[in-house]
């Protein structure tokens, strides 16, 4: 009932998924920043952005998915559900399907969510830019 594994996706498919993810990611981030006024920009979490399993610049759906599953009970669940469905289409390897733990301290938790949302938005922009600039050699970040 879901799209083929990510290694069969064409650049146009990836672009389409990213264009779906972009407004959801931006909306979540804006809502969170409105709610958590004064929270500093965070490097608390290093969200894996690109996958090295492909010639294309490709979002590492397998690595990012657990972060969104972890923050779902602490964020807008309906938007997160849509993001999870899109990220599932971008999976390469079999993702370990265990659950992700969350930082216990309240401030750490807020930083973690902010970091995930900020870095994911930046990741989407980066991949979209790479896709739009046409076929060329891409450096993969982890």
């Amino acid at each position: 009932s879901h799209m083929a594994p990510a290694h069969r996706l064409q650049p146009s498919d990836i672009r389409k998924i990213i264009l779906e993810l972009r407004p959801m990611s931006k909306g979540l981030l804006q809502d969170y920043l409105k709610k958590e006024i004064g929270l500093p920009e965070s490097n608390h979490s290093s969200l894996p952005c690109l996958s090295s399993d492909s010639q294309l610049p490709h979002i590492n759906g397998s690595a990012i998915l657990p972060y969104f599953r972890a923050i779902r009970p602490l964020s807008d669940k309906n938007t997160i559900d849509k993001i999870i469905e899109q990220l599932d289409k971008l999976k390469f390897q079999r993702e370990p399907e265990a659950k992700v733990s969350m930082a216990a301290a309240n401030f750490e938790r807020k930083n973690f969510i902010l970091a995930v949302l900020q870095q994911f938005s930046a990741c989407l922009e980066h991949v979209l830019q790479s896709l739009n600039s046409g076929p060329q050699h891409h450096h993969h970040h982890h």
Epitope: A70, P73, L74, K77, I84, E85, A98, K99, R109
Partner: antibody
Framework: QVQLQQSGAELVKPGASVKLSCKAS????????INWVRQRPEQGLEWIGW????????KYNETFKGKATLTTDKSSSTAYMQLSRLTSEDSAVYFC??????????????WGQGTSVTVSS | DIVLTQSPASLAVSLGQRATISCRAS??????????MHWYQQKPGQPPKLLIY???NLESGIPARFSGSGSRTDFTLTINPVETDDVATYYC?????????FGAGTKLELK
């Protein structure tokens, strides 16, 4: 759209077992808990337990340990609950409901239509 | 186990008026700065339907007449204004600690 489709009504004899099913569609089954809830006639809701299809992890309400066994089949996106050693006390409507994706429990946002189990000789 | 006490057990409200249902937990259901208390509506012969999640978030597709508030141990579901379609039983439920528990329910009727 997300849907949970439960199996049909069951009439079973005391001492027997019954296996109820809950087929999920419209979302990625393996990422979300499936909860099971009992409702006796004219009564409230009682949580039986949850299963996480991703790794098969389960948690049971002490009241239902030894009575209910939760399993899933990821290939068909179906959750099952087996009820054993049935008595008239087990006559109820049993619901499955989708839960959260994380170690933190969340609300049950989609529910099956319920399966009525009647235990009678 | 966390015990949830709902009050009143039944409630008769005139059309267009406000209905308020209370749910008190035997211990705090807050964690990570969030209240893991949820509200459901159930009509006869139907499964429960999620109305409010995490104390105050309106579930998608639920009318804004429904609202939730509260934290730690004291929570409120408000329906304002009440409509004919709201006749049902309402349950609170906590998901902060296993076992997950429900309140006994509040039956809403029209005066």
């Amino acid at each position: 759209q997300v849907q949970l489709q439960q199996s049909g009504a069951e009439l079973v004899k005391p001492g027997a077992s019954v296996k109820l099913s809950c087929k999920a569609s419209g979302y990625t089954f393996k990422y979300y808990d499936i909860n099971w809830v009992r409702q006796r006639p004219e009564q409230g809701l009682e949580w039986i337990g949850w299963i996480f299809p991703g790794d098969g992890g389960t948690k049971y309400n002490e009241t239902f340990k030894g009575k209910a066994t939760l399993t899933t089949d990821k290939s068909s996106s179906t959750a099952y609950m087996q009820l054993s050693r049935l008595t008239s006390e087990d006559s109820a409507v049993y619901f499955c409901a989708r839960g959260g994706t994380s170690v933190i429990r969340d609300a049950m946002d989609y529910w099956g239509q319920g399966t009525s189990v009647t235990v009678s000789s | 186990d966390i015990v949830l006490t709902q009050s009143p057990a039944s409630l008769a409200v005139s059309l267009g008026q406000r209905a308020t249902i209370s749910c008190r937990a035997s211990e705090s259901v807050d964690n990570y700065g969030i209240s893991f208390m949820h509200w459901y509506q159930q009509k006869p012969g139907q499964p429960p339907k999620l109305l409010i999640y995490r104390a105050s978030n309106l579930e998608s597709g639920i009318p804004a007449r429904f609202s939730g508030s509260g934290s730690r141990t004291d929570f409120t579901l408000t329906i304002n204004p009440v409509e004919t379609d709201d006749v049902a039983t309402y349950y609170c439920q906590q998901s902060n600690k296993d076992p997950l528990t429900f309140g006994a329910g509040t039956k809403l009727e029209l005066k």
